[in-house]
């Protein structure tokens, strides 16, 4: 099993996840590792010489850059917050701010913007992955209620006035809760089904 | 995956002109050097032209100051473009990309140059 630098007539390497083609001297030379760059090119005779990233930068894959790439901060103008900081193995990891989505995306998320408010009565829709898409907004099943206009209030139970030794005064709607009254306490007359005369 | 497709061969007289393209498509991110190789009938492939990630360039010495490789990385396109054809350019024309900040390495499927009169 030859070790790089070896010669290649066919343009290909043994290993391509570690090895790269370097097509005029027609070897294969060794890529440097995550968190290394090429600080010496490979020859016939001298494998590829690699070298730390400095601080503030990366290399993520085994490659052959001359140089590591700075690290780049989460952009709290385009919407992003950090999540894990950057390392000479990995670029700063961000995502969307709470209450926010990913508009623009290009390998990664690039621009988030405000998520839409869902009106009274609905809900947003529960996603696999937080911050990957605009709400889409549901109505509240059935016995459930959400009052408000907001990008993430849930629907709630309507209260049940019995567990409070209450009796209903008049039902829930998906927009409101149910409003419950001391038994004790008259009907007001427009709820009331006689009318004294 | 990357793909790599090549267009603007044909049959040319001695003394025209050709310009190949080779558009890759799929997956294609990154930083990559780009070559044109060529294979003429019962001969080894040859290298013909590189254009590095870092803008630099090089040719074989049998087509230096005749064929001129370049690229839009807008596009994802490599070019090559062929003056002063010879009956000995005759050949398959690949093109091929190796992905320099990670692994990668992609062929085109080839496109035929005949410079014949």
């Known amino acids: 099993q030859a070790v790089p630098p070896y010669a290649s007539e066919n343009q290909t390497c043994r290993d391509q996840e570690k090895e790269y083609y370097e097509p005029q001297h027609r070897i294969c030379c060794s890529r440097c590792p995550p968190g290394t760059y090429v600080s010496a090119k490979c020859s016939r005779i001298r494998d590829t010489v690699c070298a730390t990233c400095a601080e503030n930068s990366y290399n993520e894959h085994w490659n052959y850059l001359t140089i590591c790439q700075l690290c780049r901060p989460c952009d709290p103008v385009m919407g992003l917050e950090e999540i894990a900081p950057c390392t000479s193995k990995r670029k700063t990891q961000c995502r969307c701010q709470p209450g926010m989505f990913c508009a623009a995306w290009a390998l990664e998320c690039t621009h988030c913007e405000l998520l839409s408010d869902c009106p009274p009565g609905t809900e947003a829709e529960l996603k696999d992955e937080v911050g990957k898409g605009n709400n889409h907004c549901v109505p509240c099943k059935a016995g459930h209620f959400q009052n408000t206009s907001s990008p993430s209030a849930r629907c709630q139970p309507h209260t049940r006035c019995e567990n409070q030794g209450l009796v209903e005064a008049a039902p829930g709607t998906a927009q409101s809760d149910t409003t419950c009254k001391n038994p004790l306490e008259p009907l007001p007359p427009e709820m009331s089904g006689t009318m004294l005369m | 995956d990357v793909q790599l497709v090549e267009s603007g061969g044909g049959l040319v007289q001695p003394g025209g002109s050709l310009r190949l393209s080779c558009a890759a498509s799929?997956?294609?991110?990154?930083?990559?050097?780009m070559y044109w190789y060529r294979q003429a009938p019962g001969k080894q492939r040859e290298l013909v032209a590189i254009?590095?990630?870092?803008?630099?360039?090089n040719y074989a010495d049998s087509v230096k100051g005749r064929f001129t490789i370049s690229r839009d990385n807008a596009k994802n396109t490599v070019y090559l473009q062929m003056n002063s054809l010879r009956p000995e350019d005759t050949a398959v024309y690949y093109c091929?990309?190796?992905?320099?900040?990670?692994?990668?390495?992609?062929w085109g499927q080839g496109t035929l140059v005949t410079v014949s009169s």
């Open positions: 091929n990309i190796q992905r320099v900040d990670a692994p990668g390495f992609y």
């Open positions: 799929g997956r294609f991110f990154g930083i990559y050097d």
């Open positions: 254009s590095t990630s870092g803008g630099h360039t």
